[in-house]
């Protein structure tokens, strides 16, 4: 085996950048770092066969299967897929290794299967086998984590019923003034399911797998903080667990906490208390209210009271199924080219929504901010003053919501003209949609003031850019105007633009553009 080449098999994942489809080795896309597929010699096989680790690819993903050969001299190669030979063009990298690549753009079911690469070098022949399959993400789920009390212990377990099995982590922030952003030094992450330290300011549990990351915050009422202007509201679906933490700090241990639902003390077994001394010898108490599986009658005002602090409440609302509440009537906006503007949607939803903004079949990420009044807001400002139809789409496990917006940009018309043997046409996309005039230029009217009204046909049509209108005007040729210069003018409240057309024989026509403000 002395003369066997050193080979390396790698997988390169690409982020599609609206690239054109087709096999190509000059990738029109952004590449991720290569993943080693650890090509190993296949035992008990006739000939020298290397087998790469199985490759699972998402539908529509783009990948490159790549082999790096460290062997002296030239190599030739051939790809075989489903009994068809595919062209193979090896090249050499800076380390003088032979590089053979197979690019699969926008993965489909038909591109899944075994890819065989036959390589012939001056010393030996060998085969490399890649098995490519489509990842079955239909079976994948990522569910928001929820909390359970650990049996016989004052600790919380974080559970996320997801496929594949998620990595669960607690994200803790004990900051009063500092930022609780994930990258902040005040934030501590613990990659474990059970949490014993339950006194922190901000406690979240996050679960992540191939589908992404979902987090749940431990709902907390802090009796040492001024209550919010509006009562905090917590939504839950029937059957979900309820967890509310009440936290209070006092100079000594001489205080107690209690939970009430609609002025009735919670039953034993629906709460538990923990206490500790902080570094400055003050006493911290926390009292959890919990229901392992909520029913409709668990709705109501949950009030945490203390013998040394003003009491505070939260409204818990139990719903049969999730919802998205927002006004779905379409909205039209008309702005100037220099005006700053954002589309925005205010909504109330449970569970939290996933959302996108779409324009001209292109989707944009969607930011959300939860406001104090129980509503959330999503705004989209990245329209770059492109007129057309914009769509906000939101969904959660139980509901879907779509809202349409139209953006019109006020601007002076720009005129384009074309002509044939029988007619002349002018087009404009100014807004408001322009009106048209046609004028004939002659010896009698060198300034083109003689208006043409016969044979003019105006229309409004949809442009390729979804939702954007273009106006056109067509002048049918008559003997009276053949051979003359004519001028079409489009005008709206922002100005006028004209094009002059020579009506002679068919073919390319000289157009003279006039811009009149």
């Amino acid at each position: 085996n002395q003369d066997l080449p050193v080979i390396k098999c790698v997988l390169i994942n690409h982020k599609n950048n609206d690239s054109s489809v087709g096999k190509s080795s000059s990738y029109p896309m952004v590449s991720e770092s290569p993943e080693d597929l650890g090509c190993a010699l296949r035992p008990q096989s006739s000939g020298t066969v290397y087998e790469a680790a199985a490759v699972e690819v998402d539908v529509s993903a783009s990948i490159t299967l790549q082999v790096l050969v460290d062997a002296p001299g030239n190599i030739s190669c051939l790809w075989v897929f489903k009994h068809s030979s595919l062209n193979c063009q090896p090249h050499f990298d800076l380390q003088n290794r032979g590089v053979v690549s197979m690019v699969i753009l926008k993965m489909t079911e038909t591109q899944a299967g075994e890819y065989l690469l036959f390589i012939q070098s001056e010393a030996t022949n060998y085969t490399i086998l890649f098995t490519v399959s489509i990842r079955n993400t239909l079976l994948y789920t990522l569910r928001r984590p929820y909390f359970r009390k650990m049996e016989n212990q004052d600790a919380l377990v974080c559970i996320s019923e997801s496929v594949p099995e998620p990595i669960v982590e607690w994200v803790l922030c004990d900051s009063q003034g500092e930022s609780c952003k994930e990258e902040s030094p005040a934030v501590v992450k613990k990659e474990e399911k059970v949490l014993h330290e339950l006194f922190g300011t901000d406690i979240r549990c996050c679960a992540r797998n191939e589908l992404g990351r979902e987090c749940t915050r431990l709902f907390t009422i802090d009796l040492n903080q001024t209550p919010q202007t509006t009562l905090p509201q917590l939504f839950l679906k029937v059957g979900e667990p309820l967890w509310i933490r009440c936290k209070a700090v006092h100079v000594n241990h001489g205080f107690g906490l209690t939970w009430e639902l609609e002025n009735k003390a919670l039953e034993e077994g629906n709460y538990f208390e923990m206490s500790t001394y902080s570094t400055n010898r003050t006493m911290i108490r926390i009292l959890f209210a919990f229901v392992s599986s909520v029913a409709r009658n668990d709705t109501g005002y949950y009030t945490c009271s203390s013998s040394k602090h003003p009491s505070q409440s939260a409204l818990v609302t139990i719903v049969e199924k999730g919802f998205i509440n927002a006004t779905n009537s379409s909205e039209d906006y008309e702005i100037d080219q220099y005006e700053e503007f954002c589309f925005s949607v205010r909504f109330k939803a449970y569970p939290q929504i996933r959302c996108t903004w779409t324009f001209s079949r292109k989707s944009f990420p969607c930011e959300q901010k939860g406001l104090d009044n129980g509503y959330s807001i999503s705004k989209f400002c990245n329209h770059k003053h492109q007129p057309g139809e914009y769509i906000f789409h939101a969904e959660n496990d139980d509901a879907q919501f779509t809202k349409m917006f139209t953006l019109n940009i006020r601007r002076k018309p720009q005129v384009l003209a074309e002509a044939s043997a029988s007619q002349a046409s002018c087009f404009s996309d100014g807004y408001p949609l322009p009106s048209w005039t046609w004028k004939k230029c002659s010896d009698k009217s060198p300034n083109c003031t003689e208006e043409i009204t016969e044979g003019v046909w105006n229309r409004k049509a949809n442009r390729k850019v979804f939702g954007q209108w273009v106006s056109s005007s067509t002048l049918n040729m008559s003997e009276a105007i053949k051979g003359f210069l004519v001028k079409c003018c489009a005008y709206n409240s922002l100005g006028t633009s004209c094009e002059t057309i020579l009506l002679n024989s068919p073919g390319p026509f000289p157009f003279i553009q006039d811009n009149i403000s």
Epitope: Q228, T229, I335, E339, E340, F341, S344, K369, L371, I377
Partner: antibody, heavy 124, light 110 residues
Framework: EVQLLESGGGLVQPGGSLRLSCAAS????????MSWVRQAPGKGLEWVSA????????YYADSVKGRFTISRDNSKNTLYLQMNSLRAEDTAMYYC?????????????????WGQGTLVTVSS | NFMLTQPHSVSESPGKTVTISCTRS????????VQWYQQKPGQAPVLVVY???DRPSGIPERFSGSNSGNTATLTISRVEAGDEADYYC???????????FGGGTKLTVL
């Protein structure tokens, strides 16, 4: 050029009234929510009142509710603040300000164009 | 209604980085979009950061904002003498439909 110009300030006795005006130019006035913000001598900024682009929505600080009225005339590109039952603590420089975004939800954006202010002094 | 608390004053030498904090008296400021204004003596305020971290055109990149959890922060890097001014944070209180300003921070460039 986008501009706001306040007028109507002056000296008034406690209990008296005053009407401030703010003339806007250089932008589509009706597309923007507008606000009045005041600053007492040597003190910080205090928001007074706001009005939506069409004039349909109005908002007031608790300290002026019931005494001040905000309005606008979009045909004249002018914002107004009618101030009644004036008190000594209303003494301040009054600025009119435009929202950063056209047609904006008030939850975001802030105010990007400010006038130079008009001084209101309430004193006997 | 909640209040916004800012340090009364901060000072820094030219070329250094200075931060000004803005905290809410109750609730999380992360549920608000935060604006920052600069006001020099005898002048009207100028918007320097809006929507937590965006900058209007004409405002130098040295001005940046962030907002999460309990605190919003205005950061001015490579501080210059011309940055000496009062700085105010501002949010919209969606519960009471009010604009709320912080008390202001006087920045002194040493």
């Amino acid at each position: 050029e986008v501009q706001l110009l306040e007028s109507g300030g002056g000296l008034v006795q406690p209990g008296g009234s005053l009407r401030l005006s703010c003339a806007a130019s250089g932008f589509t006035f009706s597309s923007y929510a507008m606000s009045w913000v005041r600053q007492a001598p040597g003190k910080g900024l205090e928001w007074v009142s706001a009005i939506g682009g069409s004039g349909g929505s109005t908002y007031y600080a608790d300290s002026v509710k019931g005494r001040f009225t905000i309005s606008r005339d979009n045909s004249k590109n002018t914002l107004y603040l009618q101030m009644n039952s004036l008190r000594a603590e209303d003494t301040a420089m009054y600025y009119c300000a435009r929202d950063y975004y056209a047609f904006s939800d008030p939850a975001y954006g802030g105010m990007d164009v400010w006038g130079q202010g008009t001084l209101v002094t309430v004193s006997s | 209604n909640f209040m916004l608390t800012q340090p009364h004053s901060v000072s820094e030498s030219p070329g250094k980085t200075v931060t000004i904090s803005c905290t809410r008296s109750s609730g999380s400021i992360a549920s608000n979009y935060v604006q920052w204004y600069q006001q020099k003596p005898g002048q009207a305020p100028v918007l320097v950061v809006y929507d937590d971290s965006d900058r209007p055109s004409g405002i130098p990149e040295r001005f940046s904002g962030s907002n999460s959890g309990n605190t919003a922060t205005l950061t001015i890097s490579r501080v210059e003498a011309g940055d000496e001014a009062d700085y105010y944070c501002q949010v919209w209180d969606s519960s009471s439909d009010h604009w709320v300003f912080g008390g202001g921070t006087k920045l002194t460039v040493l």
